[in-house]
Interface confidence: low
């Protein structure tokens, strides 16, 4: 069994005698081992530092020699613990171990911050055998270090399913300050305080921050990162940036624009998309939002008729989709329409007013005093009515629609007649005798068909009856008059 040696365990000597890469007492390498690719690293750290206590894992082999002496425990030799270098420099570091020759197929792997480094890394393992032991040197090189190479590196070796781990080698890549938080562009309310944050890291630390407003430094004394700049308020747009300083030099953040929120510009290009008798569909192009999102828009509608009372109808709608259907309008009327939109600061001015018109509407009133009587001699029903009091917006009367329903012995038949606008009477042929005829009349404009009049019923007797009288629209309160002739 292999057990873990404690710190007080005596390190096994590196090699029995001189070998390539062994150290002189001044710790200077006798020979730098070249990288497999031929790259000569800028920094080479040797495998041993005599006299330093060992803290890595140690495996104690239980195999005995001819004299039956147990072999000393296996452990990686001490090496450099901390490497500091500048960005883009090259570095090479290694770990070494002496393994008795009885162990075959030993492999060393490199790990960084707990994760095995596989594939695209420059790593090489070299073996130096001797009579009883083999010296193994695992080297790792980075041709141009970056901040992402910062971390703790270790070697691992497996022997008989036991793992031997080296002491860590800490790589610290120093360079210009690196921003972890830069100021962000903002839209702020005039004369209202706001904060900007800047944070940068080394190494090397410390990192000091200077703030710059419109190319001029704000603070004479630097602040340690992270720094929060409280701006008491602005009256006009400004550009802010921060400078981060450390021993390696200076890094400047991106410049950010701080805009002052204002009321929006008025919408433009208000246009009519569609018009009906009682609605107008409009669209508009929003103006500049004043650095604050549009909240909603207001559509203002005025009757363009000079005789109107000048009242304004206001319709509120969401800012999107720049489209609104104005309803509840009068037919055949002219309107002036303007649009205004608001953000958190306030309302824009109204867009340029545009003129729009609704189309003709259907009549709103049915024909009046509908009278129906039987002209038995000609076997016709005569219908008379009074023209409804049409409003101008109802459009021009183009005629009437007459509905007459004939009901007899369970049979019902509806017929429709269209008559011109000039008359106020019509004659329809008797369809069925011994039946009830129900008549309703509606006025018609180009805008549509208006409401039908209340029904007027008349009884059509069998042939030969002579007495008859007209049937007419009922007085209010009386429903469905029927005149039996």
């Amino acid at each position: 069994a292999i057990t873990e040696a404690r710190e007080e365990a005596k390190p096994y000597p590196l090699f029995p005698g001189p070998f390539p890469g062994s150290l002189q007492t001044d710790h200077t390498p006798l020979l730098s081992l070249p990288h497999a690719s031929g790259y000569q690293p800028a920094l080479m750290f040797s495998p041993t530092q005599p006299g330093r206590p060992h803290t890595g894992n140690v495996a104690i082999p239980q195999v005995t020699s001819v004299e039956s002496k147990p072999l000393p425990p296996l452990a990686f030799k001490h090496t450099v613990g901390h490497i500091i270098l500048s960005e883009h420099k090259g570095v090479k570091f290694n770990c070494s171990i002496s393994v008795p020759n009885i162990y075959q197929d030993t492999t060393i792997s490199w790990w960084k911050d707990g994760k095995e480094l596989l594939g695209a890394h420059h790593a090489i393992t070299q073996f130096y055998p001797d009579d009883e032991v083999t010296a193994i040197i695992a080297s790792f090189s980075i041709t141009s270090v970056q901040r992402s190479d910062n971390g703790s590196y270790i070697c691992k070796m497996k022997i008989n399913n036991e793992e031997i781990v080296s002491d860590p080698i800490y790589i610290e890549v120093q360079g210009l300050p690196h921003f972890t938080k830069q100021p962000e562009s903002m839209n702020v309310t005039r004369n209202t305080a706001f904060n900007l944050t800047c944070q940068a890291v080394g190494p090397p630390e410390p990192v000091n921050i200077f703030w710059v407003q419109n190319s001029s430094r704000v603070n004479e004394q630097p602040e340690k990162s992270p720094s929060v700049l409280t701006v008491p308020g602005l009256t006009e747009m400004a550009v802010f940036s921060c400078e981060a300083h450390n021993d390696k030099g200076l890094t400047v953040s991106k410049g950010v624009q701080i805009n002052i929120k204002a009321i929006p510009s008025p919408p433009t290009e208000v246009s009519i998309r569609n018009s009906t008798a009682h609605s107008i569909l409009i669209s508009w192009v929003p103006g500049f939002d004043g650095y604050s999102p549009f909240r909603n828009c207001s559509i203002q509608v005025k009757e363009a008729d000079p005789l109107s009372n000048g009242s304004v109808m206001i319709f509120n709608t969401s800012a999107l989709p720049h489209l609104y259907q104005i309803k509840q309008l009068q037919a055949l009327a002219n309107y002036s329409i303007g649009v205004s939109c608001m953000n958190e600061i306030g309302w824009s001015a109204v867009s340029p007013w545009i003129l729009a018109s609704t189309t003709e509407g259907a009549p709103s009133v049915a024909p009046l005093n509908v009278t129906v009587f039987l002209n038995e001699s000609s076997d016709n029903v005569d219908i008379r009515w009074m023209k409804p009091p049409t409003k101008q917006q109802d459009g021009e009367l183009v005629g009437y629609r007459i509905s007459h329903v004939w009901q007899s012995a369970g049979i019902s038949k509806e017929l429709l007649e269209e008559v011109g606008q000039n008359g106020s009477r019509a004659r329809i042929s008797v369809q069925v005798h011994n039946a009830t005829c129900t008549v309703r009349i509606a006025a018609v404009t180009r805008g549509g068909v208006g409401p039908f009049s209340d029904p007027v019923k008349i009884f059509i007797p069998a042939h030969g009856w002579v007495d008859y009288a007209p049937s007419s629209t009922p007085a209010p309160g009386n429903a469905d008059p029927v005149l039996i002739i």
Epitope: H278, M313, I314, F315, K327, Q328, V449, P451, F452
Partner: antibody, heavy 121, light 107 residues
């Protein structure tokens, strides 16, 4: 959110006048296009529309009942009222108030829970 | 007045079925018809307005259509919670008028 609540006497005797109140929240009859109407439902006769009042005080009544109906509003209190004169047993029903938004005859999108009325001598 | 006729007083169906409730207007009402659902003990709730537009929050198994003055409410994949009375109403002209209602029973 929009809510409507009807209140009424519950029981009346024939020939009395029914007074109903609709109290609403979540909208205002000051707002262009808003309207509130009354509908009743009797067990045998389904739903019957009674009257409607718009934001601009325009009023509409069912012609069959017009002579007995009066609709009015108190915009500041968010209330609409309906009076039915000279009730008889055929007026026994559940009375609902409901809202129309849009300023034109349209569908009632929010209804109250209804208040029952029994007319009995 | 415009008469809205719902000839089916009661319709019986099973969960998962497709059912059509019809309503006939006595005269032209365009698309100005709304369908309401009224569950027992509740007030009516709008389902479909302007003939075919679903009111917000209404499941898409409810659809509306029209042919002339005949209006149809179709419920596909009927669920037990659809047990209710269904009314049509025209808002084409005053006085607004309602159908007499169709009661949907779940077998």
């Amino acid at each position: 959110q929009v809510t409507l609540r009807e209140s009424g006497p519950g029981i009346l005797q024939p020939s009395q006048t029914l007074s109903l109140t609709c109290s609403f929240s979540g909208f205002s009859l000051n707002t262009f296009g808003m309207g509130v109407g009354w509908i009743r439902q009797s067990s045998g006769k389904g739903l019957k529309w009674l009257a409607h009042i718009w934001w601009d005080d325009d009023k509409f009544y069912n012609p069959a009942l017009k002579s007995r109906l009066t609709i009015s509003k108190d915009t500041s209190k968010n209330q609409v009222f309906l009076k039915i004169a000279n009730v008889d047993t055929t007026d026994t029903a559940t009375y609902y108030c409901a809202r129309i938004e849009g300023g034109l005859p349209y569908y009632y999108d929010y209804w109250g829970q209804g208040t029952p009325l029994i007319v009995s001598s | 007045d415009i008469v809205m006729t719902q000839s089916q007083k009661i319709m019986s169906t099973s969960v998962g079925d497709r059912i059509s409730v019809t309503c006939k207007a006595s005269q032209i009402v365009g698309t100005n018809v709304v369908w309401y659902q009224q569950k027992p003990g509740q007030s009516p709730k709008a389902l479909i307005y302007s003939t075919s537009y679903r009111y917000s929050g209404v499941p898409d198994r409810f659809t509306g259509s029209r042919s002339g003055t005949d209006f149809t409410l179709t419920i596909s994949n009927v669920q037990s919670e659809d047990l209710a009375n269904y009314f049509c109403q025209q808002y084409n002209s005053y006085p607004f008028t309602f159908g007499s209602g169709t009661k949907l029973e779940i077998k």
